[in-house]
């Protein structure tokens, strides 16, 4: 009866098609989630840059469903996974098709979470337990962080740690997606 | 752990404005959803406004709309409650209250130890 | 603006149960208005005992249980102790909203 198939851990991942699967159409919604959107033209010296803004890092999209104990999300959430190295923008696999990965011999820049968002989620529960509902966090934008020799590679992996920590997607920045328009995404790609 | 520090008591008089402060510790203010609440002397709870991560912005109650402002310095990690046009019947002990910063987002679980604001001629 | 309703005042005896309960004006209390539940003491700051209808936190005794009953929000304290005399808010979220009940005076004698 259970949902032994599922990770109690909210962290079951349904992969999309493709290696890096886009993001689904933007809908006709003023509220529009927030992507990283800090390309722009590559430094004249990359090394020498203090301006993180002109790195950019991939996100990659998940779908997934949400776990809470035997619980599991009526639908599955989409949401982002930073991934790869930082480099300039254009230089970048998803900037360009055919770029090559640059591997950067200066300053250790690290893709990461960088804002995120809140969605409602309704979780249904086996053995006749009554449903919950819930908000649940999700990354709403990834960012290049430049690390120093004092960031340590536990940061890396711990998005708890203060490298690493989700920011919320505040204005003037763009709005984070609503949740009314994540499900109504959420409903026309499946 | 978060932790909330507020301003100290303010005396105003009507027509006046006054802003309260909210200092966190522990984490950014950039990382948690920050709202305000406020109670009268033997009166309830009531809600102002706060930051409301699904649509990313910070938002009011209708009561209060146009008469209060909410702002974050995130270079001091500070919050700011404005109140203007206070009445008499705005003094109260106003409090900010946080979310926690874990992978469910519930609010309201750190609490500042409250700001007395007496409104009086 | 919605209203939200609570018993005004509540008795328990020490080791009684009792069911606090939270109603909207804009009719059945579901899930979806995430009700939360604070207590607070006298000279204190509010604190969380439950969101979410019925999570409790780290911090909430066992003896307090959040739910839904006929058509409201409800918190039951089951095995009251003396120091759990105190006001006892509801609090209900309309979309991003939030809207507080009057709260109830809880007396354990």
């Known amino acids: 009866q259970g949902w032994q198939a599922f990770k109690n851990d909210a962290t079951e991942i349904i992969p999309e098609l493709g290696e890096y699967p886009e993001p689904p159409p933007e809908l006709e919604n003023n509220k529009t989630m927030n992507r990283a959107e800090n390309g722009g033209r590559p430094p004249h010296h990359p090394f020498e840059t203090k301006d993180v803004s002109e790195y950019s890092c991939r996100e990659l999209h998940f779908t997934r469903y949400v776990t809470d104990g035997p619980c599991r999300s009526a639908k599955p959430v989409t949401e982002l996974v930073c991934s790869g190295q930082c480099g300039p923008a254009r230089l970048l696999p998803n900037a360009i098709g055919r770029g090559k990965w640059w591997r950067p011999s200066g300053p250790d820049f690290r893709c990461i979470p960088d804002r995120y968002r809140a969605q409602r989620v309704q979780l249904l529960c086996p053995g006749g337990e009554a449903p919950r509902a819930r908000k649940v966090r999700l990354v709403a934008s990834c960012k290049c962080k430049r690390l120093t020799r004092f960031h340590n590679q536990s940061e890396l992996k711990d998005f708890g740690t203060e490298a690493a920590r989700p920011q919320k997607g505040r204005k003037p920045r763009p709005r984070a997606r609503s949740a009314k328009a994540n499900q109504a995404e959420l409903e026309n790609a499946y | 752990e978060v932790q909330l520090v507020q301003s100290g008591a303010e005396v105003k008089k009507p027509g006046a404005s006054v802003k309260v402060s909210c200092k966190v510790s522990?984490?950014?203010?950039?990382?948690?959803?920050m709202h305000w609440v406020r109670q009268a002397p033997g009166k309830g709870l009531e809600w102002m406004g706060g930051?409301?991560?699904?649509?990313?912005?910070?938002i009011y109650a209708q009561k209060f709309q146009g008469r209060v402002t909410m702002t974050e310095d995130t270079s001091t990690d500070t919050a700011y409650m404005e109140l203007s046009s206070l009445r008499s019947e705005d003094t109260a002990v106003y409090y900010c209250?946080?979310?926690?910063?874990?992978?469910?987002?519930?609010?309201?679980?750190?609490w500042g130890q409250g700001t007395l604001v007496t409104v009086s001629s | 603006q919605a209203v939200v309703t609570q018993e005004p005042s509540l008795t328990v005896s020490p080791g009684g149960t009792v069911t606090l309960t939270c109603g909207s004006s804009?009719?059945?209390?579901?899930?979806?208005?995430?009700p939360y539940w604070f207590q607070q003491k006298p000279g204190q700051a509010p604190r969380t005992l439950i969101s979410?209808?019925?999570d409790k936190h780290s911090w909430t005794p066992a003896r307090f249980s959040g739910s839904l009953l006929g058509g409201k929000a409800a918190l039951t304290l089951s095995g009251a102790q003396p120091e759990d005399e105190a006001e006892y808010y509801c609090l209900l979220d309309y979309g991003g909203r939030f809207v507080f009940g009057g709260g109830t005076k809880l007396t354990v004698l």
């Open positions: 522990g984490y950014t203010l950039t990382e948690l959803s």
């Open positions: 930051f409301d991560p699904e649509d990313g912005e910070t």
């Open positions: 804009t009719g059945t209390v579901t899930i979806d208005h995430y």
């Open positions: 979410d209808t019925d």
């Open positions: 209250a946080t979310d926690t910063v874990g992978y469910w987002e519930k609010f309201f679980q750190h």
